[in-house]
Amino acid sequence: MNGRVDYLVTEEEINLTRGPSGLGFNIVGGTDQQYVSNDSGIYVSRIKENGAAALDGRLQEGDKILSVNGQDLKNLLHQDAVDLFRNAGYAVSLRVQHRLQVQNGPIGHRGEGDPSG
């Protein structure tokens, strides 16, 4: 019998330096394109190999981006969020929410990380 699946949610501040093709990740979400039901937040859909985010190593696919340079990403249209990233400057501070899946099974079963949330 499988155990209950819980999520450990943590927040982190990540500072990235823009590379030749941006910050090195793709986003989904927004008020006009909800990626998660009843949540119009902005999520990381892909980390580009050798891009700024991949080289930093902390941002993960499935992370929710809460703010960019202190600007809240709540209730934004998808394109407005994209424009924020495009115009964020050379040094960019991201506040992100990681969601780690942990399975509470029988004793002896280890938790499993699922960065895609």
Epitope: S21, N26, Q33, S45, V82, D83, R86
Partner: nanobody, 125 residues
Framework: EVQLVESGGGLVQPGGSLRLSCAAS????????IGWFRQAPGKEREGVSC???????YYADSVKGRFTISRDNVKNTLYLQMNSLKPEDTALYYC????????????????????WGQGTQVTVS
Amino acid sequence: EVQLVESGGGLVQPGGSLRLSCAASGFTLDDYAIGWFRQAPGKEREGVSCISTHGSTYYADSVKGRFTISRDNVKNTLYLQMNSLKPEDTALYYCAASYYSDYEVAVCRSDALDAWGQGTQVTVS
């Protein structure tokens, strides 16, 4: 350096077919939401078809059922198969990529993309 180079345009009769190619260099194509755009003389640029990194596709109503977008990740090339061409498809066709958006509809409707090719001319006459 990020570069997109289109090819495959030409003169074709109504009802004919063409296959456009967009070769990418300086980046890995499947890391980007990317699409095909066109601009006819005196008209605004429009998004024709776009594809997300996960393969979701969008087509403008005017080309649905006639055009097919695809991507070859080994060749790092984007394609647009154009069938049943009409005179109103005459335009300069560009490919363009977004560094951030992974929403194919938004990419095709955006006027603020990050990498553009020079275009290839398609004339249906």
